[in-house]
Interface confidence: low
């Protein structure tokens, strides 16, 4: 996850080991049904098991194992590259089975100067080289393999594309003598894409071009280009579609002004003004268009760039997103809140909410955290009853059904669903507030007493009476 | 596999004490608040004790506060419910349950240990 | 504390047909869009299983026999079709404050 986080998220579980599951012999035929579920109701969980359990008992004699691993390869077209000028790459785990790809962009904030971008270089290594990368890593939330963890898609072909442009997926410069870095972030999409054609996905049914924080401005930014570069390498059929989680921000006024000095105050529409001259950055043409010359920053910005895209796209955004506090000055430490911080709050909530009006398939529970749909516990969080991945489901369901021209939305499967309670955590399945000194959890009728709300708005959802809350903070828990 | 089992019920004399204990596994124990739980014979379930994760957190049923301390040690993984001023009434099968963070339901239970509270 | 009232104390059911268990509340236990009750089913010598989170929502590896709805103060656990191995005692359970509480129990008979 990214930057400098005041409160984290309960930490995660780790991944479930690899288990021994039958595979088909080496050198075997194999002899695959590309079958497509997207529109199976009733209950996901066990249907998805069932056919897991059907398909590995398909092979009982075997003794290779499954491997659940992403397996790490690097471009072949060794001039597409990292910041430091080594080869980018990704991580890919086939599923011969299925027609369906998934590519993950990572995030991990950005650099937009010299300085800070070698700063970037000395601290954060992994994001801008591809020189200590694992050969392997293991696929978690919506990139497991496991129908457990990930309901929603287990079965697709995984692609994990590590970040190390340092862009936000944007740049289209390579390194010289007068660039001491590449920023090639758009170029290593259409590349991992060129060469995944030859790997299988020239028979895809569905891309879906998935990121979190920085890799889900990635998405917004990129898939339109990622579209219309399939259509003009002759594969009109792929249907691509977008799920950016967490990359959803809004250039809105700063809680406290500070000058641009570093990556994490600087306000976010100076850095990305400055990154894009920096990155030679590029932006979806619908939305360039809309903008005058100077001003293709405007496209960063979900709400902005969302309604030139064509490719459909799922927006996941926390209300209370951890990365937009912290380039809103927002820092929540020592001190109880102010009463002009808890409306700011507030206040970002309920504009972030308002973005996501006209946005018909969105999932956006009131909860302070950052990034969610690659970690192992995706599935906790619902809004209004609805998981994220029964949302994507259902998404998928609409979107096989858009062809019979009905625009109504699919009974008992919603896809806008965007909490309305006004307050961080309100929603009582939200990941656990954490201090980001001690680790502890933390008490959420304390975080929100911190934060200044008055003792019948924090009891409430909390299951407490405000007379137990008042005597459990009293006896100093 | 997530799994929580209890120990430590024993028959014990009216006035006397006793400590339960409940072992966690398969999951990352300090993530999770944790309560006790108890089932007299032919009778329904009644809540007795809730600790938070990181033991910030402690409350009690009316019937078993100041009698009742429950506790937890995050490192070794386990729970504890240390019991003193036994009644008669208190006889029952206690049970220790994960408290799942979406809300407050209890969504591993222990296979529970038998106290009796018998002169 | 809230007092959950369960109805009916005992239900005999034909094989295949629904059977439904009502739990009311002394008082609300939905806030904010969500309802804090949930339903549970012991079987004799074993621990309570989780059926039902947040009212309507079916724990993970539950058959979808199984079924929650309502809000505020009323609430229904539903099994349809109804199987011999679902004949047991059933538990509605609130965590709208402390403490939470649990109903008296529903025991399910199949004939």
């Known amino acids: 996850s990214e930057g400098r986080k005041t409160w984290r998220r309960r930490g995660q579980q780790p991944p479930p080991p690899p288990r021994t599951e039958a595979a088909p012999a080496a050198g075997q035929p194999v002899e695959s049904f590309p079958l497509d579920f997207t529109a199976v109701e009733g209950n996901m969980d066990s249907f998805m098991a069932q056919v897991k359990s059907l398909a590995q008992s398909l092979y009982p004699c075997s003794a290779q194992q499954l491997n659940e691993d992403l397996r790490l390869h690097l471009l072949l077209n060794t001039s597409v590259t990292c910041n430091d000028g080594s080869p980018a790459g990704y991580y890919l785990k086939e599923s011969r089975g299925s027609r369906r790809w998934l590519l993950f962009l990572e995030g991990g904030w950005y650099c937009f100067n010299r300085e800070n971008c070698d700063s970037r270089y000395d601290t954060m290594r992994r994001l801008m080289s591809s020189r200590d990368w694992p050969r392997t890593r293991t696929g978690t939330g919506i990139l497991s393999s496991q129908p457990e963890e990930n309901p929603y898609w287990w079965n697709a072909n995984m692609v994990f594309i590590p970040y190390c442009s340092s862009d936000v997926w944007s740049g289209a410069s390579s390194k010289s003598e007068k660039n001491e870095y590449a920023f090639m972030g758009a170029l290593i999409i259409q590349e991992v894409v060129r060469e995944l054609l030859g790997r299988g996905l020239s028979g895809a049914k569905v891309l879906l071009l998935a990121g979190s924080a920085a890799g889900g401005t990635g998405v917004l930014l990129n898939v339109d280009r990622v579209a219309e570069q399939l259509e003009k390498l002759g594969y009109p059929a792929i249907q691509v579609r977008g799920l950016a989680d967490s990359g959803w921000f809004l250039d809105n006024k700063q809680y406290r002004h500070t000058d641009c000095v570093d990556t994490i105050t600087c306000a976010p529409t100076e850095a990305i003004r400055r990154g894009i001259r920096y990155w030679n950055g590029v932006v979806p043409e619908r939305c360039r268009r809309q903008f005058q010359e100077g001003e293709e920053w405007n496209c960063f910005f979900g709400y902005k760039v969302y309604p030139t895209l064509r490719c459909p796209v799922f927006v996941v955004q926390w209300l209370f997103d951890e990365a937009q506090l912290t380039v809103d000055n927002v820092h929540l430490t020592g001190q109880p809140v102010q009463e002009g911080l808890r409306l700011y709050i507030q206040n970002l909530g309920r504009e972030l909410r308002h973005t996501l009006k006209d946005v018909p398939a969105s999932f956006a529970p009131a909860c302070l955290s950052h990034e969610i749909i690659i970690r192992s516990h995706w599935t906790d969080v619902q809004v209004k009853g609805t998981s994220l991945p029964r949302a994507l489901h259902c998404w998928d369901r609409s979107l096989h059904d858009s062809h019979k021209a009905s625009k109504t939305p699919l009974k008992g499967c919603p896809v806008h669903l965007v909490d309305s309670c006004p307050w961080p955590h309100c929603n009582p399945s939200c990941p656990t507030v954490r201090d980001q000194f001690t680790g502890q959890e933390m008490n959420v009728a304390q975080f929100l007493m911190h934060m200044g709300f008055d003792m019948q708005t924090v009891a409430q959802p909390q299951g407490l009476e405000p007379s137990e809350l008042l005597g459990m903070l009293s006896n100093g828990s | 596999e997530v799994q929580l089992v209890e120990s430590g019920g024993d028959l014990v004399k009216p006035g006397g004490s006793l400590k339960l204990s409940c072992a966690a596994s398969?999951?990352?124990?300090?993530?999770?608040?944790m309560h006790w739980l108890r089932q007299a014979p032919e009778k329904g379930l009644e809540w007795v004790a809730y600790i938070s994760s990181g033991s910030t957190t402690l409350s009690y049923a009316n019937t078993m506060k100041g009698r009742f301390t429950i506790s937890r040690d995050n490192a070794k993984k386990t729970l504890s419910l240390q019991m003193t001023s036994l009644r008669s009434e208190d006889t029952a099968i206690y049970y220790c349950?994960?408290?799942?963070?979406?809300?407050?339901?209890?969504?591993?239970w222990g296979t529970g240990t038998t106290v009796t509270v018998s002169s | 504390d809230i007092v959950l009232t369960q109805s009916p104390a005992s239900l005999v059911v034909s094989l295949g047909q629904r059977a439904t268990i009502s739990c009311r509340a002394s008082?609300?236990?939905?806030?904010?869009?969500?309802?804090?009750m949930h339903w549970y089913q012991q079987k004799p010598g074993q621990p309570p299983k989780l059926l039902i989170y947040l009212a309507s929502n079916l724990e993970s590896g539950v058959p979808a026999r199984f079924s929650g709805s309502g809000s505020g103060t009323d609430f229904t656990l539903n099994i349809h079709p109804v199987e011999e191995g679902d004949a047991t005692t059933y538990y509605c359970?609130?965590?709208?404050?402390?403490?939470?509480?649990f109903g008296s129990g529903t025991k399910l008979e199949i004939k």
């Open positions: 398969g999951f990352t124990f300090s993530d999770y608040g």
């Open positions: 359970q609130h965590s709208r404050v402390l403490p939470p509480t």
């Open positions: 008082k609300s236990v939905s806030e904010s869009g969500y309802s804090y």
């Open positions: 349950a994960r408290k799942n963070y979406n809300g407050g339901y209890f969504d591993v």
